[in-house]
Interface confidence: low
């Protein structure tokens, strides 16, 4: 015997309230396949989010951050403050690299300069703290039949692993009951 | 159909921590939540908290606050309930189910149920 | 936290008869947005819990229509029609419209 919801397709829901009839998704939600007994909830970029792709019946709404953040997470799930190059993002908002330290971009953190005399170089030129230093030749690279010294391009911060954070309630007043009423889905910080 | 499998039993010593997964197969795993709930032997059904797998915030009954973790892994379809400084009394089946809060159906309520993972805490 | 409170918590039926379980909570369950997050679960022997009812009285698919439910504000019931030897087990009613989400200490429903 087929079941008779393999019928309602995407952009629908088979409503077991209304004999298995497909009935559009309602407002605000999505089945991104047939067949489904219920819709998702379209995600809301809301606050610090901004509508990169507006929800459809069939697909979800897709999130990126406003001007002055950047994207963490899979998905877009955070947004987390730019900083100026020359700084990191601290509990304490964007604070300046320590001395000895760069960051060439508006995200991540403020990490050591190259000591370049580990690999047996001087420093060509000095770093700050939006650049790391550029380590010269060494004699053996200056010894007839080496190759041309070019400058290394600074090192890029590696990607952000998605970070997920925490906000602990206990009892019953959590303050997140709005969920299920508003039907949004927000990051706070 | 989404289901949702969970990790096999474990046998744990008093004052140890657990970790049981729950991996979600067959369906979106981002727009909806995932509450952990336990049974003692013999006993009722307990709720533990819930996590949502995307935006990553956690919400916690007060009982376990402090002891209890849960996270999700989106590119895994998996969420992760963690219990720490075990005690005898911790010994139950732990359940991952889905929590819609959705506006068709069902709202506020657990529409999909794990397996049960059984976690025995024993010297 | 809201408590749940069932009765009877234990049920002895016959085939093709009616029955009934209550649930009560320690406070209203409507919420700030005038719904209603009460729901029941079955839970057979050995098996995980099982969604029947969400919503106070709406049936989640694939459930009998002997099964219905009904209730408000603090007092709700949870009727069985005509019970089948399938639906033995424990029920139990759970709160939804606040954290941290609450259920009843279940109703063991036996054949006599």
């Known amino acids: 015997l087929q079941d008779p919801c393999s019928n309602c397709p995407a952009g629908t829901f088979c409503d077991n309230n209304r004999n298995q009839i497909c009935s559009p998704c309602p407002p605000n939600s999505f089945s991104s396949a047939g067949g489904q007994r219920t819709c998702d909830i379209c995600r809301q970029c809301k606050g610090v989010f901004r509508t990169r792709k507006e929800c459809s019946s069939t697909s979800n709404a897709e999130c990126d951050c406003t001007p002055g953040f950047h994207c963490l997470g899979a998905g877009c799930s955070m947004c987390e403050q730019d900083c100026k190059q020359g700084q990191e993002l601290t509990k304490k908002g964007c604070k300046d690299c320590c001395f000895g330290t760069f960051n060439d971009q508006k995200r991540g953190i403020c990490r050591p300069w190259t000591n370049c005399s580990l690999d047996g170089k001087s420093v060509l030129v000095n770093g700050t703290k939006e650049r790391d230093v550029v380590c010269g030749p060494s004699p053996a690279d200056l010894s007839p039949g080496a190759s041309s010294v070019t400058p290394p391009a600074p090192a890029r911060e590696p990607g952000h692993s998605p970070q997920h954070h925490h906000h602990h309630h206990g009892g019953g007043g959590s303050g997140l009951n709005d969920i299920f009423e508003a039907q949004k889905i927000e990051w706070h910080e | 159909q989404v289901q949702l499998v969970q990790s096999g039993a474990e046998v744990k010593k008093p004052g140890s921590s657990v970790k049981v997964s729950c991996k979600a197969s067959g369906g979106e795993f981002s727009n909806y939540f995932i509450s952990w709930v336990r049974q003692a032997p013999g006993q009722g059904l307990e709720w533990m908290g819930m996590?949502?797998?995307?935006?990553?915030?956690?919400v916690y009954a007060q009982k376990f606050q402090g002891r209890v973790t849960i996270t999700a892994d989106e590119s895994t379809s998996t969420a992760y309930m963690e219990l720490s400084s075990l005690r005898s009394e911790d010994t139950a089946v732990y359940y991952c189910?889905?929590?819609?809060?959705?506006?068709?159906?069902?709202?506020?309520?657990?529409?999909?149920w794990g397996q049960g993972t059984l976690v025995t805490v024993s010297s | 936290d809201i408590v749940m409170t069932q009765s009877p918590l234990s049920l002895p039926v016959t085939p093709g008869e009616p029955a009934s379980i209550s649930c009560r909570s320690s406070q209203s369950l409507v919420s700030p947005g005038d719904n209603t997050f009460l729901s029941w679960y079955l839970q057979k022997p050995g098996q995980s819990p099982q969604l029947l009812i969400y919503?106070?009285?709406r049936r989640f698919y694939g459930v009998p229509d002997r099964f219905s439910g009904s209730g408000s504000g603090t007092d709700f019931t949870l009727k069985i029609s005509r019970v089948e030897a399938e639906d033995v087990g424990v029920y139990y009613c759970m709160q939804a419209s606040t954290f941290p989400r609450t259920f009843g200490q279940g109703t063991k429903v036996e054949i006599k």
């Open positions: 996590v949502h797998p995307i935006e990553g915030w956690a």
């Open positions: 189910a889905r929590d819609r809060p959705v506006f068709c159906c069902p709202r506020g309520a657990f529409d999909i």
């Open positions: 919503e106070i009285e």
